[in-house]
C-alpha cells in the first residue's frame, strides 16, 4: 500500500480501562498529532479506520464491529466498548486516509481487573487537598460523554472499601465529593461508581483517585533556614575536613520550585577553584512540607578557605532567604614551656 505517515506507538497515552465496563477511546490523531479535528477531516472526505494487534501477537487485524449487542462500535472519532472484556487488551491503531493522504497512530489499551475493594494495577491520579482549609471538592473523573445529559446516573462514593455515608467531614454530592475540613485521616483512595441505563442495560463506570492532604497556603511561610545559625561556629585547623550543613524548611506550596544553594565568597561552588563537594538530601512531612539539607564539604581546608564567606541561600514561591555560616580558624593552644634556671651561684 502507499506511504502512510506513521506516528508509531503512542506510549504516552497508556490507556487503562476496567474489565466489564464501558470505555470510550478517542483517536489520539486529532488530539495530539494533527492540526485539524475529526469534523474537518470527515467533511474533507477522509475516512477513519480502526484495527488492532492482540496482546503478545504481531498480526494487525480489523476490529470486529459486528459483535452481539454492538459490544464494540465506532462513533465519529471514538471507539466504544460496551463493555470491555479482558482479552480486548492490545495495541489499537486509528488511521485517517483517502486516496492521497494517510496518517496513523497506535496506542496501548490495557483492560484491568479490580477486586471488590477497587484495588487494581490501574495508575491513579492524585488530587491534593489543603489541610483544614475550608470546603474543597474532588470530582468523579473521566465520565463525560458516556451518557446524555437527560440521563440521571446514580453515583456512589467509597473511601477504600467503605461507602461514604457516615463520614462527618465528607459529603457526597453527586459527581462531587465535598470535604468540609480535609484532615490527614482523609488521605487515601476514593472511588466513585457511576451507574446509568442504556438501551435496557445497566452500565457501571468505576473511577478511583488518590487524595493527598497537603499543607495549606494559609499556613505557608518563606523558607526557614535552621542551619547554619548564630549558635554554631565551625572552628577548624588547616588540613581538617570542613562540613557545614544547610538545612532549610519549606512550607508546601502547590507547583512551587524549592531551591537551596551555597555561595562561597559570593560565587557558586562550581565557579571557584577550591575542591568542594555538596551532597543534598530531601525529606517530607505528612503534609508534604519539605526539608532540604545540603552539606558543603571541603576535605582538607586551608587557612585561606577558613577566611572565606560561606552563605546558604534558599528560595520558594514565598520568598528568598540567606544565612552565613560562622567559620573561623582554630587558634592553636598556647604551648607553655617551663624554663628551669638552676643557678648555683658562688658566694
Amino acid at each position: 500500500s502507499e506511504r502512510c505517515d506513521d506516528w508509531g506507538l503512542d506510549t504516552m497515552r497508556q490507556i487503562q480501562v476496567f474489565e466489564d465496563e464501558p470505555a470510550r477511546i478517542k483517536c489520539p490523531l486529532f488530539e495530539h498529532f494533527l492540526k485539524f479535528n475529526y469534523s474537518t477531516a470527515h467533511s474533507a472526505g477522509l475516512t477513519l479506520i480502526w484495527y488492532w494487534t492482540r496482546q503478545d501477537r504481531d498480526l494487525e487485524e480489523p476490529i470486529n464491529f459486528r459483535l452481539p449487542e454492538n459490544r464494540i462500535s465506532k462513533e465519529k472519532d471514538v471507539l466504544w466498548f460496551r463493555p470491555t472484556l479482558l482479552n480486548d487488551t492490545g495495541n489499537y491503531t486509528c488511521m485517517l486516509r483517502n486516496t492521497t493522504y494517510c496518517s496513523k497512530v497506535a496506542f496501548p489499551l490495557e483492560v484491568v481487573q479490580k477486586d471488590s475493594c477497587f484495588n487494581s494495577p490501574m495508575k491513579l491520579p492524585v488530587h491534593k487537598l489543603y489541610i483544614e482549609y475550608g470546603i474543597q471538592r474532588i470530582t468523579c473523573p473521566n465520565v463525560d460523554g458516556y451518557f446524555p445529559s437527560s440521563v440521571k446516573p446514580t453515583i456512589t462514593w467509597y473511601m477504600g472499601c467503605y461507602k461514604i455515608q457516615n463520614f462527618n467531614n465528607v459529603i457526597p454530592e453527586g459527581m462531587n465529593l465535598s470535604f468540609l475540613i480535609a484532615l490527614i485521616s482523609n488521605n487515601g483512595n476514593y472511588t466513585c461508581v457511576v451507574t446509568y441505563p442504556e438501551n435496557g442495560r445497566t452500565f457501571h463506570l468505576t473511577r478511583t483517585l488518590t487524595v493527598k492532604v497537603v499543607g495549606s497556603p494559609k499556613n505557608a511561610v518563606p523558607p526557614v533556614i535552621h542551619s547554619p545559625n548564630d549558635h554554631v561556629v565551625y572552628e577548624k585547623e588547616p588540613g581538617e575536613e570542613l562540613l557545614i550543613p544547610c538545612t532549610v524548611y519549606f512550607s508546601f506550596l502547590m507547583d512551587s520550585r524549592n531551591e537551596v544553594w551555597w555561595t562561597i565568597d559570593g560565587k557558586k561552588p562550581d565557579d571557584i577553584t577550591i575542591d568542594v563537594t555538596i551532597n543534598e538530601s530531601i525529606s517530607h512531612s505528612r503534609t508534604e512540607d519539605e526539608t532540604r539539607t545540603q552539606i558543603l564539604s571541603i576535605k582538607k581546608v586551608t587557612s585561606e578557605d577558613l577566611k572565606r564567606s560561606y552563605v546558604c541561600h534558599a528560595r520558594s514561591a514565598k520568598g528568598e532567604v540567606a544565612k552565613a555560616a560562622k567559620v573561623k580558624q582554630k587558634v592553636p593552644a598556647p604551648r607553655y614551656t617551663v624554663e628551669l634556671a638552676c643557678g648555683f651561684g658562688a658566694t
Epitope: 483544614e132 475550608g134 470546603i135 474543597q136 471538592r137 455515608q165 457516615n166 463520614f167 462527618n168 467531614n169 465528607v170 459529603i171 457526597p172 454530592e173 453527586g174 465535598s178 468540609l180 475540613i181 484532615l183 485521616s185
Partner: antibody, heavy 120, light 113 residues
Framework: EVQLEESGGDLVQPGGSLRLSCAAS?????????ICWVRQAPGKGLELVSC????????WYASWAKGRFTISRDNSKNTLYLQMNSLRAEDTAVYFC????????????WGQGTLVTVSS | DIVMTQSPSSLSASVGDRVTITCQAS??????LAWFQQKPGQAPKLLIY???TLASGVPSRFSGSGSGTEFTLTISSLQPEDFATYYC???????????????FGQGTKVVIK
C-alpha cells in the same frame, strides 16, 4: 454513657448577653466531631445555630447568627460554649446541643436542652 | 441558602395506618437528608440519615426514600408511640461561597384520628 448536657439558660433582658455550656461525657472532643447548637422557639420548629469541629476548632454559623453569637470549645474540659450577645425577644428558645448534626451521621446525639428567655 | 418544605404540616391517622410525609428541597441536595422524630418536652431523635439509611435502634417500619429534591418518610404501620412531630434536615455545600447550607423542614405533626 455517651451524653450531652446543656446549662446556662436563663431569663435575660433584650440587648443582654448569655453564655450557654454543653458538657460532653463518654467521648472526647479531641476526636473528630461536629458539635452544634440547635434552637427551638416555643411551639416552633428546629433551627441550626452554629457548629464547631472539635479536633480542629473550625466553626460554622447560620447566616443570621454571624456577629452576635460565638461558638467555642474547651477540649480539656470536654465542654462546648455558645456566647450570645445583643439578645432579642426572638432568640427566646430551648437551646439544644447535638453531635454530628452538620453532616448527619448515625453517631447523632442530643442533649435535653436549656431554656433561654429574652424579655423585659 | 436552601429551603426545605415539608408536607403536610399535620396529619391525623390511626394505629396500623401507613403514613407518608414528604420533604422538598429548593435545590439538589442529592441524598444528604435526615429525618428526626420529636415528642413534646424531648430532644429530637434521629430516624434516617443519607435519605434512606435507618439509624441504629430505629424500628424497620420507618423507611426513607428519594434523592435530589424530593424525599419521603414512610411509616408502614403506625404504632401508638409514633404520634409525634417529624422534621427533615437537608444539607448541601456551595463551593463558590465556601459555605455549607442546611435547613430543617417546618415539621409534620402526626396526631391520633
Amino acid at each position: 454513657e455517651v451524653q450531652l448536657e446543656e446549662s446556662g439558660g436563663d431569663l435575660v433582658q433584650p440587648g443582654g448577653s448569655l453564655r450557654l455550656s454543653c458538657a460532653a461525657s463518654g467521648f472526647s472532643f479531641s476526636s473528630n466531631y461536629w458539635i452544634c447548637w440547635v434552637r427551638q422557639a416555643p411551639g416552633k420548629g428546629l433551627e441550626l445555630v452554629s457548629c464547631i469541629y472539635t479536633s480542629t476548632g473550625n466553626t460554622w454559623y447560620a447566616s443570621w447568627a454571624k456577629g452576635r453569637f460565638t461558638i467555642s470549645r474547651d477540649n480539656s474540659k470536654n465542654t462546648l460554649y455558645l456566647q450570645m450577645n445583643s439578645l432579642r425577644a426572638e432568640d427566646t428558645a430551648v437551646y439544644f446541643c447535638a453531635r454530628d448534626l452538620l453532616v448527619v451521621t448515625s453517631f447523632n446525639l442530643w442533649g435535653q436542652g436549656t431554656l433561654v428567655t429574652v424579655s423585659s | 441558602d436552601i429551603v426545605m418544605t415539608q408536607s403536610p404540616s399535620s396529619l391525623s391517622a390511626s394505629v396500623g395506618d401507613r403514613v407518608t410525609i414528604t420533604c422538598q428541597a429548593s435545590e439538589d441536595i442529592y441524598s444528604n437528608l435526615a429525618w428526626f422524630q420529636q415528642k413534646p418536652g424531648q430532644a429530637p431523635k434521629l430516624l434516617i440519615y443519607g435519605a434512606s439509611t435507618l439509624a441504629s435502634g430505629v424500628p424497620s417500619r420507618f423507611s426513607g426514600s428519594g434523592s435530589g429534591t424530593e424525599f419521603t418518610l414512610t411509616i408502614s404501620s403506625l404504632q401508638p408511640e409514633d404520634f409525634a412531630t417529624y422534621y427533615c434536615l437537608g444539607v448541601c455545600t456551595d463551593i463558590s461561597t465556601d459555605d455549607l447550607y442546611n435547613a430543617f423542614g417546618q415539621g409534620t405533626k402526626v396526631v391520633i384520628k
